[in-house]
C-alpha cells in the first residue's frame, strides 16, 4: 500500500489534484478518508474503484473527462458524505450507482451531460442535503425520483432543457411545496412556457397535447 508518486498523502487524505492522472490510483492505504482527484484526465471509473476504502468520507472527481461509471464504483462506502462529480462527461447514471450511500449529504453532478435519470437513482440517499444537477441535458424527470430525498434542502436544476408538459407537472407541485430549488430552473419548451421558472408556473399549465 502506497502513496502514488505524483500525489501527497497525509492525515488520511490523498491529494492528487491536477497531476495528469488518466486512471484512479490503486493500492492506496485502506484508512484514507478523503481522495482528491480533481483536474486530471480520468475517463473511466472501473468496478469497485473505491470499494477497498471503507472509511472514505469525501471523493472529488470534478473536472475530469469521466464518461463511464461502473455500477459498483462506490459500493460499500457507508461513511461517504460528499461525492463531487461536476465538470465531467457523464451521460447516464448506471442502475444502483448510489446504492448504500446512506451517509451522503452532498452530491454534485453539475456540468455533465446527463440526459435521463432512473426513477430509483437516489433510492438510498435519505440524508442527502444538496443535489446539484445544474447544467446537464435533462428534458424530463420521472415522478418519484426525488421522493427518497427526505433531508433535501437545496437542489440545483437550472440550465437543463426541460420540456414542461404533463409529465413534469409533478415537479412544479413538488417545488411549490418544497421551495428548495435555488438555481432558477426554467422550461425550454413548449414555447408558451419557455424561459419561465418551473417553480412559479401554475400546475394546470403543464399539459400534453
Amino acid at each position: 500500500l502506497h502513496c502514488p508518486a505524483a500525489c501527497t498523502c497525509s492525515n488520511n487524505i490523498v491529494d492528487c489534484r491536477g497531476k495528469g492522472l488518466t486512471e484512479i490510483p490503486t493500492n492506496l492505504p485502506e484508512t484514507i478518508t478523503e481522495i482528491r482527484l480533481e483536474q486530471n484526465t480520468i475517463k473511466v471509473i472501473p468496478p469497485g474503484a473505491f470499494s477497498p476504502y471503507k472509511k472514505l468520507r469525501r471523493i472529488d472527481l470534478s473536472n475530469n473527462q469521466i464518461s463511464e461509471l461502473a455500477p459498483d464504483a462506490f459500493q460499500g462506502l457507508r461513511s461517504l458524505n460528499s461525492l463531487v462529480l461536476y465538470g465531467n462527461k457523464i451521460t447516464e447514471l448506471p442502475k444502483s450507482l448510489f446504492e448504500g450511500l446512506f451517509s451522503l449529504q452532498l452530491l454534485l453532478l453539475n456540468a455533465n451531460k446527463i440526459n435521463c435519470l432512473r426513477v430509483d437513482a437516489f433510492q438510498d440517499l435519505h440524508n442527502l442535503n444538496l443535489l446539484s444537477l445544474y447544467d446537464n441535458k435533462l428534458q424530463t424527470i420521472a415522478k418519484g425520483t426525488f421522493s427518497p430525498l427526505r433531508a433535501i434542502q437545496t437542489m440545483h436544476l437550472a440550465q437543463n432543457p426541460f420540456i414542461c408538459d404533463c409529465h413534469l407537472k409533478w415537479l412544479a407541485d413538488y417545488l411549490h411545496t418544497n421551495p428548495i430549488e435555488t438555481s432558477g430552473a426554467r422550461c425550454t419548451s413548449p414555447r408558451r412556457l419557455a424561459n419561465k421558472r418551473i417553480g412559479q408556473i401554475k400546475s394546470k399549465k403543464f399539459r400534453c397535447s
Epitope: 469525501r58 460528499s82 433531508a151
Partner: antibody
Framework: QVQLVQSGAEVKQPGSSVKVSCKAS????????VSWVRQAPGQGLEWMGG????????NYAQKFQGRVTITADESTDTVYMDLSSLKSEDTAVYYC???????????WGQGTLVTVSS | DIQMTQSPSSLSASIGDRVTITCRAS??????LNWYQQKPGKAPKFLIY???NLQSGVPSRFSGSGSGTDFTLTISSLQPEDFAIYYC?????????FGGGTTVEIK
C-alpha cells in the same frame, strides 16, 4: 489539508454590522462546505449557517435568517460572514469550519472575537 | 430542532482513570453523531465522527459508541492533555446542534 485563517478581533456598537473573513490556505475549498459556528463567553457552540463556494447559495439556521449573510469569493478562496443589527448578546467568538458534509466540522479556523458594546 | 443533552456537565478524574461521557438526542439520529474536544482559548478539535469512527491522528484511548438516541464517549486511560471540554453534535438534520458540553477536570 486545508487550513482556515480568520480575520482579527472586532469591537462593534449595538445596531451596527460586522464582517468576518475566513481564508483557505494550503488548498482550495471551492467544493467543500464552509460553516460558521459561534460561541458566546463561557457558553456552548451554535451553528449559524454554511455555504459551498462554487455554488454561492448559503444555508442558514432559522434563528439567524435575515440577519446573517454568508458569501464566498472563489478567486481568493475566502468566505465571509456578515452579521447585522448587532446586540450585546452577539458578543462571541465566531469560528469558520469546513468538512466532508454540510454538518460535520473537520477543520476549524482559529476564531474571531466580536465584542458588541456601547 | 434536535436537542442534544450531555451528562454530566462536569466531572473530576485522575490521570489513568477511565472516563465516560454520555449524550442523548431528543429524537432518533441513527449514528449521525460527532464528538469534539475544546481547550481554553482554542478552537474545537474534531475527535469522532459517525458515533464511533476516530478522526485521523486522534489517540486510540478515545472511543465512541451508540446509535439512535443514546451515545457515549469513552477515554480509556485519561492523560494530562485530555483535560478539556467535550461536545457532542448531531449531523443528522438541519440545523446541526451541539450538546452543552462536559468539562473534564483534574481531581
Amino acid at each position: 489539508q486545508v487550513q482556515l485563517v480568520q480575520s482579527g478581533a472586532e469591537v462593534k456598537q449595538p445596531g451596527s454590522s460586522v464582517k468576518v473573513s475566513c481564508k483557505a490556505s494550503g488548498g482550495s475549498f471551492r467544493s467543500y462546505t464552509v460553516s460558521w459556528v459561534r460561541q458566546a463567553p463561557g457558553q456552548g457552540l451554535e451553528w449559524m449557517g454554511g455555504i459551498i463556494p462554487i455554488f454561492g447559495t448559503a444555508n442558514y439556521a432559522q434563528k439567524f435568517q435575515g440577519r446573517v449573510t454568508i458569501t464566498a469569493d472563489e478567486s481568493t478562496d475566502t468566505v465571509y460572514m456578515d452579521l447585522s443589527s448587532l446586540k450585546s448578546e452577539d458578543t462571541a467568538v465566531y469560528y469558520c469550519a469546513t468538512g466532508s458534509g454540510w454538518y460535520t466540522f473537520d477543520y476549524w479556523g482559529q476564531g474571531t472575537l466580536v465584542t458588541v458594546s456601547s | 430542532d434536535i436537542q442534544m443533552t450531555q451528562s454530566p456537565s462536569s466531572l473530576s478524574a485522575s490521570i489513568g482513570d477511565r472516563v465516560t461521557i454520555t449524550c442523548r438526542a431528543s429524537q432518533n439520529i441513527n449514528a449521525y453523531l460527532n464528538w469534539y474536544q475544546q481547550k481554553p482559548g482554542k478552537a474545537p478539535k474534531f475527535l469522532i465522527y459517525a458515533a464511533s469512527n476516530l478522526q485521523s491522528g486522534v489517540p486510540s484511548r478515545f472511543s465512541g459508541s451508540g446509535s439512535g438516541t443514546d451515545f457515549t464517549l469513552t477515554i480509556s486511560s485519561l492523560q494530562p492533555e485530555d483535560f478539556a471540554i467535550y461536545y457532542c453534535q448531531q449531523s443528522y438534520r438541519s440545523p446541526p446542534t451541539f450538546g452543552g458540553g462536559t468539562t473534564v477536570e483534574i481531581k
